[in-house]
Structures are given as C-alpha cells and as structure tokens.
Interface confidence: low
C-alpha cells in the first residue's frame, strides 16, 4: 500500500515570496508523484515546480496559486493511487491603486457645500487599514469637518469647502506590508474670496545694467492684496524701497520692474497674494545676473596627416549657458564635412597639411563673448638636408658628424654609437641642428654612428662609419727622470704608435754616440752594466713617413740603491725609561731618514721634548709611556728609491723584585738598560 509519510498542509504565504508544499510517500513498488490544483495536474514552470515529491514555489502568486493543492502518488504497475489531504495558501498581499472620486459622479459637479467622497483603491489581504493625506499631511477622524473612517477606504468631506482644496493621497498597510496610492486626486473647490494665480513670475537672466521685469497677478472677490519681497523678506513698495533696490518699481497691475540691475540685486523675489479668506499664495522667481567666465587656455596641438583628431573646447562657465562655436581664418566651421564642429568639439577628419593654423573657440551669452585660440600643427615626416657620411677624424681633435633634416614641427635628433644611445656628456654634444660633435676624438671612437630624426609623423635614420686617424704619440710617454742602479743591468723602454708603425731610436742629447755596452733594441735602451758615465740626458725619437717625428727627453741618473746598515729591533722598555730605535742607511745620493710611528710621519720640527731623531737616523724617546707602544717604521729615501724597515716598541711596568731573586738575575725579555 502507498503511505504518505509527509502530507501537505495549508499555510500562510506572502505574495512574491518562496513557499514549499511538502509531500513524501513510501510504497513497496516504484511510484511516481504529481500534484493537482483544483483537480487539474500542475505543470512545472520556473516559478512553480516539483522538487523531489514536494511542490516548490519560487514566488507565490495570489492569482495562480489560489485553490486546493493535492499530492497524488501512483504505482504504474498495479494502478494503485493515493491522494494526500488538501492544502491551500492563505496569501497575504497588498497592491497600490489610485485615489478616485466616488461622489459626486464627476469633478464638474463638485460645488462648495456639497458632500465629496473619495475612494482609495489599494487592495490587499488581509483587509488593509487606510490612512488619508492632504498635501502630504495626515488626516484624522473628525478633523476640519470631515468624516474619515481609518478602517474604510472611503474619505467623506461633508460639507466640502474651499479649505478642503488640495492633493489627496492615501496609504494602507496590512500583515504583508504598506502601499501608497499610485495616482492622487487634486480637489479644487473655488472660493471667490481666495486669492488665485492669474499670472506667475518667471525666472529671468539679465546682463548687468539691463532691466528685469517680473509679472504677477492674482484675482479674488473682493480684489486681493499683492506684495513683493526680496530674499531676506525685505518688502518692496514704491514708498519704501530697501537701499539695494532703489531702482525698483511696482506697477498697479502687480508687475515689478528693476532697472540698471547690479550683482546685489540677484536672488529670489517673492510675490504674495492675500485674499479676504484663505491662505496667502506665494510665488517665487529668481533673478540671475548673466555672467561668463574666462576660457581656459589651449595647449598647442600637433597632429599627423591622415589621422582623425578632435579638440574639445571646454566652454566657460556662464549663465545662461554659453553657446559655443569654432572658427578658422575668421569663418565659422560647418556642422559636417571634413573639418567641422560637433557639439563643443572641433573635428578634423583625415587631416591634411593645409589644415595647420590657428582655430578659435568662441563662447557667448547675454554677459558677453569669450574666445580662445588653439594652434594646430600638422606634423610631417623629416626629410634629409645632409646625411651623416663615413668620416676620418683626427685623434685628439674635435670631430663632427652631420644629421641635418627638416620637418614640421622641428624634428628631434638622437644619435647612437654602436647601437647605444649617446647621452650628452663632456665628450659628446648634439647641436640644435642635429650635428654631433665629438670633443677630443679618441682611438676607440672609431665605430658605427647612427642618427634618428623624428616627429610625431614618423622618423628617418642613417648611419656612418668613423675611422680615427691616430696621431703619432708615445705609448706610454717615457718618464722624464729615471734612475739606474750602479753596476747593475738596466733597461729604459720607449714605444710609440701612429697611423703607420713608427721607427724608434735612442740618442744622447749631446749628439754623442752610445757606448758599446749600451744597445738600442727596437726602442728599448739596454745597459749591460751601468757605469757612472751612463748618467745624462737621452732622447727617444719616434718617426714615420706621413707624420714626421716626435721626441721624448729622459734624464738618467746613476745611483747606488739604498741598503740599511743598521735596522731597528724589537724593543721592550720600562715605563719612564728611555727607548732607542737605531736606523742607519747608505746609498748614493745619500738617503734621508724619516720615522713613522703609529701610522703617522714623525715631523722632526714638531716632536716635542721627549723625542729626538739623531743625525745618523736613530730615534730616541725619553720618559716612555704605555701610549708610545706600537710599530715604528724607519723610511730611507733619495731621489732614486725608497726603502723602509720596521720594529715594534713595547712599554711595560717595572716589576717589584722578589726576595728570592738575586741582584744579578736577568729580566725575562731583552731590555734597554739606561
């Protein structure tokens, strides 16, 4: 047998919200479940569909979902069928509608003192509670001679009078929510004694010093009073005008005239009509002073031929809003064509070179006119005046490579050396016309150079090879003073380069020939064994065919190189005693001795009373202190060479003698006894 585990049950539902009718069955065989609504099968839709055995509602609809739902389970094999209990929705909803006149039958029949009934067509379930409004203000029961039933949808005004005139609206709420009238009803009950508008003032915009007129008329029986006010409630009459409205005139027909308008006259003017009965009727109008501000400047524009470009004219702020137009060569641009105006934009379609020039954006209103020019340049691709050419540049002199081009606008030229961009520095300079100057040409400047000339329209480029014509020069130049060690072998090198490999030879400055033990071997002067006579002035001569010859003069000195006869030793001294650091050097010329102590040269003229350097080079330090400890360097130097030797000095405390030590016991380290 088919058994319902869960049966659908009647329930509350909200219009447009989700809902679910549950149904679950158990059966021995295979059953299929479907639903009935008022006995008819339910078809699945996106809004209402079966979900398992249950019926799901994405959005309950009060019209389509009213009725009785039933879940049916059927065994297709046995034909057995079971039906659930009936279930239905109690759908809560509310729907807006208009306020309509119920009595009398038409607006034409509404007269003062008649009964007027309005009906609020807001419907809902459960039955809504209603609230009425006049001109947005809630009405309550019995208020100002009207009978209102807040539970009813009708509003009865008995009797209706002019004071009931206004815009009637209603709102209603129930358990579902709230809705307000979709269309409101304007009740107009004329009372001849009420002021009624015949002519309302309009906002005006006037230029400075012009005149402004506001018209204002009311009608009533008896005739109404009319009063004008400005801004801060200042009354305007022909008898009492405020100081800033001296030129205001109120005419008998209610019109207000302002002459020679000034900025302080701008603002809100109110015209007030007051009948014998009823509220004052207030009409407002604003006087604006026409004005126009300056236009922002245009940046010059550069366009390329064949492209489409637009230039937007930012109109100046103005009141009234200024009209804007473009002119070229004094002629207003059309609204179509190749060069035309579209809105505030200047449009140049398929730009030609002839389109270049000054275009003017004009803006004008009551306050005046403004204009602003924009200079439009049509860019062209550069053309050659002079291309860079393969060049031979002389080493050490300035060299020039030309890259002369012409275009609109003036082209920018950049240079590359070996594919690397040349940035201007002390050696390279790019002139305004595109020429590259290489200051002080060097051998390695011989390479490829490329110049690129560009405008927004395109670029051209060309390259050239630079060959550097090397100057005849010594590489490196020989030292002008050199020393040779007496009785030793010595060499003095001399080499040179040029456009052609130069020939190098040595000679004595006095023109005498070189002795047999001195040889000139491919520019190297070789002394097999230096003698005193080898000292003197020598000249190295380098020469080649195209460049002639160059000379380098060298003064050779023969010297006995420095050796130390006495070197300072590692020395330890008691604090307060005297330290002696001996140093003696020999050589020719006779060497001078300098001492360096603790990383600074000891200046003999600034040693103070404790230190002294003897003629023979020894350093003596009296009354030594711990801070005198450190490394001391003896430096021996003459015009030919320099040598140094160093030793540490230790300053220690004198030990107190122990009983066991005899007077003749030696100290544990080498001491200088003083």
């Amino acid at each position: 047998a088919i058994v319902f585990i869960k049966q659908p049950s009647s329930q509350d539902a909200l219009q447009g919200r989700r809902a679910l009718l549950r149904c679950e069955v158990e059966a021995p065989g295979l059953v299929h479940v479907y639903w009935l609504l008022d006995g008819a099968p339910v078809q699945d839709t996106e809004r209402r569909f079966t979900q398992g055995s249950s019926l799901s509602f994405a959005a309950v609809d009060r019209l389509q979902d009213s009725g009785t739902f039933q879940c049916v389970a059927r065994d297709d094999v046995t034909g057995e069928e079971a039906r659930s209990a009936n279930a239905s929705f109690n759908i809560k909803w509310i729907e807006a509608g208009p306020v309509v006149l119920k009595h009398p039958a038409s607006e034409a029949e509404i007269q003062p003192q008649t009964q007027v009934t309005l009906r609020c067509h807001i419907d809902g379930h459960p039955r809504p509670t209603y609230q009425w409004f006049r001109d947005g203000t809630p009405l309550s029961d019995g208020q100002s001679n009207n009978t209102v039933s807040s539970k009813e949808r009708n509003l009865t005004l008995r009797p209706a009078g002019p004071e009931h005139s206004g815009l009637y609206s209603c709102c209603a709420h129930n358990a579902f929510g709230q809705a307000c009238s979709s269309q409101n009803f304007t009740l107009s009950i004329a009372d001849e004694s009420f002021a009624r508008v015949v002519l309302a003032p309009q906002d005006v915009i006037v230029a400075r010093n012009e005149e402004a007129m506001f018209h204002c008329q009311f009608s009533a029986q008896p005739p109404p009073n009319l009063q004008w006010l400005f801004e801060d409630e200042t009354p305007i009459t022909n008898r009492s005008r405020p100081p800033h409205l001296r030129r205001a005139t109120v005419f008998a027909n209610g019109s207000l005239l302002l002459t020679q308008v000034r900025p302080r006259n701008a603002g809100v003017y109110r015209c007030i009509g007051q009948g014998q009965r009823g509220p004052p009727v207030i009409l407002e109008a604003t006087l604006h002073l026409a004005e126009i501000e300056d236009m922002p400047l245009f940046e010059p524009r550069v366009f390329t031929a064949g492209s489409e470009e637009r230039v937007t004219c930012l109109p100046p702020k103005g009141l009234p809003e200024p009209s804007v137009w473009w002119e070229h060569a004094g002629v207003r641009l059309p609204t179509h064509g190749r060069v035309y105006q579209k809105g505030h934009e200047l449009v140049l379609a398929s730009i030609a070179e002839s389109d270049a020039g000054v275009y003017t954006c004009h803006a004008a209103n009551l306050a005046g006119q403004r204009r602003q020019d924009v200079n439009i340049t049509v860019a062209t691709v550069p053309t050659w005046l002079k291309k860079p050419q393969d060049s031979q540049l002389e080493e050490g002199k300035p060299g020039y490579l030309h890259c002369l081009t012409q275009a609109t606008p003036k082209p920018t030229v950049v240079w590359y050396r070996n594919q690397m961009l040349i940035s201007e520095d002390s050696r390279f300079e790019v002139f305004k016309n595109g020429t590259l100057r290489i200051n002080n040409v060097e051998v390695y400047d011989g390479t490829w150079y490329r110049c690129v000339s560009s405008t927004p329209a395109g670029s051209i480029e060309a390259q050239a090879r630079v060959q550097v014509l090397e100057k005849l020069k010594f590489t490196p130049p020989p030292q002008p003073q050199q020393c040779m060690e007496f009785d030793k072998e010595a060499t003095v090198p001399c080499s040179a380069t040029g456009r052609e490999k130069p020939t190098i030879k040595w000679e004595r400055a006095d023109g005498s020939s070189l002795p047999e033990w001195v040889t000139d071997n491919a520019g190297t002067l070789h002394f097999a064994r230096v003698t005193r006579d080898d000292a003197g002035n020598y000249t190295c001569i380098a020469s080649n065919g195209p460049q002639g010859q160059i000379r380098a003069h060298v003064q050779l000195t023969v010297a006995v190189f420095i050796t130390f006869k006495v070197e300072p030793e590692r020395t330890t001294v008691y604090q307060g005693h005297t330290a002696l650091l001996q140093c003696e050097a020999q050589g020719d010329p006779k060497p001078l001795i300098q001492w360096k102590g603790k990383d600074r040269i000891l200046d003999p003229t600034k040693l103070g009373p404790r230190m002294h350097i003897f003629q023979n080079g020894s350093l003596v330090i009296h009354d030594v202190a711990p801070e005198d400890s450190g490394r001391y360097t003896c430096i021996a130097g003459n015009s030919c060479n320099i040598k140094h030797t160093e030793a540490p000095l230790y300053v220690v405390d004198k030990p107190v003698p122990e009983e066991s030590e005899g007077p003749g016991s030696p100290p544990p380290y080498k001491m200088i006894q003083t």
């Epitope: 701008a266 603002g267 604006h288 004005e291 940046e299 937007t312 109109p315 702020k317 103005g318 009141l319």
Partner: nanobody
Framework: QVQLQESGGGSVQAGGSLRLSCTAS????????MVWYRQAPGNEYEWLST???????YYADSVKGRFTISRDNAKNTVYLNMSRVKPEDTAVYYC????????????????????????WGQGTQVTVSS
Amino acid sequence: QVQLQESGGGSVQAGGSLRLSCTASGFTFDDYDMVWYRQAPGNEYEWLSTVSRGGNLYYADSVKGRFTISRDNAKNTVYLNMSRVKPEDTAVYYCAADLRSVPSTYRARTCRGRYCRDYWGQGTQVTVSS
C-alpha cells in the same frame, strides 16, 4: 551615494608646500572634469584649476606656476600640489566634479545650500602664516 572627500589641509609657512587630495566615490570618475575651488572668509568661491576628463590642465592666473593639478583615474583621486604658498592662499579648499554648466560665482551667490552645486566635497582648511 556620491562622495568627495578632501584631505591634506593644514598649516604651512609662506613659501612652503602642501598637497591636497580628493577621493571620489559613487559616480563614474572618468566622465567628469575635476575642479578645485577655494573660499576665503567673507569671499565668494574662487575657481583655481580644472583637470578635464581628457587630462587637459587649466589654471586661474592667481595660482598659475605655483599650483599643479593632477588626477589618478585608477584611484578615483584628484590632487592639488601647492608650492610657494602665500598668506592670501588661506581658505577652505573644495574639490568638485564639474558638469560645466554654471559658473562658480553664480552658484556661490544664488545657492543657499550645497545641493545646487554639482558634486562637491566638504572642504579642507589651509592656513598660510607669514
């Protein structure tokens, strides 16, 4: 809803520099010209500078060469870099998203509330002392 929030105001010595920022939300920033105004005590609103939606820059004569306007569409922000400031630059500085229809002087005079400007910020005070 639409919001424009200025920041960066404060006190600065004459000759000094200041950077004002204005961050926008609630509207399509790229579509609007962004504008800086200022109002000194007792004075009308004064237009200072505009950066158009296309990126063109415009300046009032009183600030040309001293103030620089810029915009960052990715950050919905407009900036005003103030340099070489003078005591007469003391004012409340406002930024606005400008629809370009009505001049600022008109708005300042005839509008009794902020509702009748396009989109305006609340302002940031800048005080320049000598």
